[in-house]
Every structure is written in structure tokens, then in C-alpha cells.
């Protein structure tokens, strides 16, 4: 899977959207590595 910063940001945005934004506060692109996906 793509693990560039931009890919991680877009994947996280999709995850946030699907979860309705109900995630931990520290669940942000600069804290979340590609392995989290």
C-alpha cells in the first residue's frame, strides 16, 4: 500500500468519514503511520 504522507492523509480522511469522526484526538496524519491501516 502507498505510504507517502499524502496517501496516509487521504486514507485517514476516508477512515474518519466512515467512522463519522468518532476517533481519538491523536488520530491525525502526523501521528498515524502507514502500518495503522
Amino acid at each position: 500500500a502507498c505510504d507517502t504522507a499524502t496517501c496516509v492523509t487521504h486514507r485517514l480522511a476516508g477512515l474518519l468519514s466512515r467512522s463519522g469522526g468518532v476517533v481519538k484526538n491523536n488520530f491525525v496524519p502526523t501521528n498515524v503511520g502507514s502500518k495503522a491501516f
Epitope: 502507498c2 499524502t6 496517501c7 487521504h10 496524519p29 502526523t30 501521528n31
Partner: antibody, heavy 119, light 107 residues
């Protein structure tokens, strides 16, 4: 409102260095990567590198490795791009850009900083 | 580095026309492609990410498609404010790379 405000135009001599700043507001600066891109007159866009403002970790285009240095001042929500050993081919508009998720999912760009390298 | 080859480099069109711009990557980039619009003297404006998703506020006349190596940006009905230069970008691999641009001019 998310804003990326860059420093003003610079004129430099060949061999000198330039440091461009990008002040972020309207979102949590440390949450999102900052990219730097340049565009020489009449040329395509060229990615310089990105920085994780939270950790200071960087990725560079090998073309600029050793000449470009990306840094941040977290307390000032400001990113910096320094380019050394300037040559005439470095004359370009330099942009900072960041893809933000909250408050608005969008790819925000600074207004650009013109750097002219001339003897 | 991955090369992004855009075509055509320029085109002339009229208001209301359907315009198609293509971008070919030198290797597989999955759907990790973005499209930008740039007007003279201005910063690029993001239109599309992940090959086919519009950012909020981008008019529905802009659409993107493709995966792997071949990508397309379509403007279904060209408006006066759409005359600009358009760039594709791949962000699948470092370094991110851009196409050479397509200038959309008034016929």
C-alpha cells in the same frame, strides 16, 4: 479560516541562500504534513519535499537533497524552506501546501514567494 | 522518478464544450493522482484527489477517472472561469511528480 501566508519576494546572488517562511493558521499545525513545491517561469510544478511538523521528519526530492532544508517552528505554527548554493535555475515561485482534514478537507496552498537569483 | 506525461499540452475550446485531458504515468501509481487548476500569477487550486474524488466546493462539471497508469480529467461543460492550465500529480511514490500541464484557451 485556514490560511497559509508566505514571506515576501527575495532577490539573491548566485551562491547565496534563501529562507522562505509559511505561517499557518485556522487549523492544528502539527496535525498535517507540509509540502513545498516550486515553479520556474513557464515550467511545470516541482515537488521539493515534505515535513511532519509534529516530529520534524522530512522527505526530500533527491534533486534538492543537500541544498534544501525543511524546518518548522511549532510555537509559531510556521514552516520554513531554506535553499542554499543558489543558481539562476532556482529562480522560481515557491509554494507551501498542506492537505487538511479538520476543519475542512481540502488541499490548501500559500500565495507563493518569488525568489529571483541574479548577479 | 515517475514521469507524468500530459496531453495535449494546449487546447482551444469554447464555452459549453466538453474537454478531456489525459495523463499517463511511467509506472503504476494505483489511484494516487491529483489534478490542479492554475491561473496566471496564482497558486494552484486543487480539484481532484485519489483520481476521481472532488474536493468540497469543486463544481460537479469537473470529474476524474483512471487507475494504474492512465488518468483523465474531464470538464463536462466548459465555463468562462475554467480557462486555465491544468496539472496532474502522482503521490504514490516519492518524489511526487507533476505533468507538464495542459493550457485550456478560448477558441
Amino acid at each position: 479560516e485556514v490560511q497559509l501566508v508566505q514571506s515576501g519576494a527575495e532577490v539573491k546572488k548566485p551562491g547565496a541562500s534563501v529562507k522562505v517562511s509559511c505561517k499557518a493558521s485556522g487549523y492544528t499545525f502539527t496535525d498535517y504534513y507540509m509540502n513545498w513545491v516550486r515553479q520556474a517561469p513557464g515550467q511545470r510544478l516541482e515537488w521539493i519535499g515534505d515535513i511532519n511538523p509534529n516530529t520534524g521528519g522530512t522527505n526530500y526530492n533527491q534533486k534538492f537533497k543537500g541544498r534544501a532544508t525543511l524546518t518548522v517552528d511549532k510555537s509559531a505554527s510556521t514552516a520554513y524552506m531554506e535553499l542554499s548554493s543558489l543558481r539562476s535555475e532556482d529562480t522560481a515561485v515557491y509554494y507551501c501546501a498542506s492537505i487538511i482534514i479538520v476543519p475542512n478537507y481540502f488541499d490548501y496552498w500559500g500565495q507563493g514567494t518569488t525568489v529571483t537569483v541574479s548577479s | 522518478d515517475i514521469q507524468m506525461t500530459q496531453s495535449p499540452s494546449s487546447l482551444s475550446a469554447s464555452v459549453g464544450d466538453r474537454v478531456t485531458i489525459t495523463c499517463k504515468a511511467s509506472q503504476n501509481v494505483d489511484t494516487n493522482v491529483a489534478w490542479f487548476q492554475q491561473k496566471p500569477g496564482k497558486a494552484p487550486k486543487s480539484l481532484i484527489y485519489s483520481a476521481s474524488y472532488r474536493y468540497s466546493g469543486v463544481p460537479s462539471r469537473f470529474s476524474g477517472s483512471g487507475s494504474g497508469t492512465d488518468f483523465t480529467l474531464t470538464i463536462s461543460s466548459l465555463q468562462p472561469e475554467d480557462f486555465a492550465t491544468y496539472y496532474c500529480q502522482q503521490y504514490n511514490n516519492y518524489p511526487y511528480t507533476f505533468g507538464g500541464g495542459t493550457k485550456v484557451e478560448i477558441k
